[in-house]
């Protein structure tokens, strides 16, 4: 009996530019002789329904149809037919199929590969055109994929140390697509510093599929206006 097992759940998520290993394990009732077996990996794009050969291994012959693609003969001896793709790109997401032949038996499995890019986040203070005692804080999130992203603002005061979500005076712009396929978005918070307590901590909170935990960038309101430090203005908070 010949069986192939792919990633549990049928989906594998990988970061953009990672050297991804797409898992495929072979279960066979006898020891594997790699000189008399074949492995073929196929890819089907998300955008068109055509299957393309990525890698082929037969006996001593192996061929990569995608540059850098590799199945390890050393790993194969232990039943591991995983495919390694160095420097994975967004457009390489889709369905991957691992087909194993141990004559006369054939087995296959498929997995969906999702490629994600994590946002970088930074806070900026924009004073241009603002009225007296009014500040506009911008939270820029850039380089993320997929497009869906959630940006919220929270504040913590000395009276209320638990974060409170701010819903007023928040404007989040449209997402902008970059040349490389990733996205950028900016969310703005308008503050009237004369009405806010010094020591209040404000946070821009970014939630995205690529992040295990939300990305938080914060600043503290001090007695003086425009309390953002230089690092807070320009640093990447990721």
């Amino acid at each position: 009996d010949l069986k192939v097992e792919m990633m549990a759940g049928g989906t594998q998520i990988t970061p953009l530019n990672d050297n991804v290993t797409i898992f495929c394990n072979i279960f066979y009732s006898q020891p594997l002789n790699i000189t008399s077996m074949g492995i073929t990996w196929f890819w089907k794009s998300l955008t068109f329904d055509k299957e393309v050969k990525v890698f082929e291994f037969f006996g001593d012959h192996q061929e990569a149809f995608r540059p850098g693609a590799i199945v390890s003969p050393w790993r194969l001896k232990s039943g591991d037919a995983s495919l390694r793709l160095p420097g994975i790109q967004l457009e390489e997401a889709g369905e991957y199929r691992c087909e194993v032949v141990v004559t006369p038996l054939k087995a296959q499995g498929t997995v969906q590969l999702e490629v994600v890019a994590s946002p970088a986040s930074r806070l900026l203070l924009d004073q241009v055109g603002m009225k007296e005692n009014e500040d506009k804080y911008m939270c820029e999130s850039s380089g993320f994929y997929p497009e869906a992203i959630n940006i919220t603002w929270e504040k913590q005061t000395q009276k209320f140390p638990h974060p409170i979500e701010i819903s007023e005076d928040v404007i989040t712009g449209p997402t902008i697509k970059n040349m490389d396929g990733t996205f950028n978005v900016t969310s703005c918070l308008k503050l009237n510093s004369s009405q806010e307590d010094p020591g209040t901590v404000y946070q821009c909170v970014v939630r995205h599929a690529s992040l295990h935990t939300p990305l938080r960038s914060n600043f503290t309101l001090t007695a003086a206006r425009h309390s953002l430090s230089e690092t807070e203005k320009t640093d990447n908070f990721s």
Epitope: D18, N19, T21, F23, N25, W74, K77, G79, D80, S82
Partner: antibody, heavy 119, light 107 residues
Framework: QVQLVQSGAEVKKPGASVKVSCKAS????????IHWVRQAPGQGLEWMGW????????NYAQNFQGRVTMTRDTSISTAYMELSRLRSDDAAVYYC????WGSGTFNIWGQGTMVTVSS | AIQMTQSPSSLSASVGDRVTITCRAS??????LGWFQQRPGKAPNLLIY???SLESGVPSRFSGRGSGTDFTLTISSLQPEDFATYYC?????????FGGGTKVEIK
Amino acid sequence: QVQLVQSGAEVKKPGASVKVSCKASGYTFTGYYIHWVRQAPGQGLEWMGWINPHSGATNYAQNFQGRVTMTRDTSISTAYMELSRLRSDDAAVYYCARERWGSGTFNIWGQGTMVTVSS
Amino acid sequence: AIQMTQSPSSLSASVGDRVTITCRASQDIRNDLGWFQQRPGKAPNLLIYAASSLESGVPSRFSGRGSGTDFTLTISSLQPEDFATYYCLQYYNHPLTFGGGTKVEIK
């Protein structure tokens, strides 16, 4: 950067067990096999086995079969090697090492964990 | 298990010397062989994989040759930092086995 950080030195009595940890960082933990290699004082290198962090599959050298257990916790990117029924000749530096993808060579090594077995 | 016999077990050489270390496998291992350098008190460091491929970041004075059962590691011009112990490793078959090591000492 890519690195493996091992737990600290251990002193054990004969017959006891030791569990050494190996924390990976800077790469996708599940994508590369972790091997364990030991080196007795003044001696050469001895391969103990490997674990596939993705599947948990293992392959142990015959010498250690029945005494060694290799496990992993993918949530904290850590591999473990437990050796039981320790003897005085198990005193050695134990290394974890990451494979160079798809070959049996190892291009990233932990700093080593000294295990002393003494009554 | 495949036996890996390394020779010599030790050698003395001077800076600038050309040094060759040999590793012989007890059966055909194709080119599934690696070479490691180990300095005292440190973890080994991969020099060569697949018998002749230089690991990235390793100086080009190190080279590997061979296929089947006979393999060599050559250091074309020995440098002060090359005084160390060298090991070969076969990964053609389980269990993986190391050679006994070659200690390169200062003459």
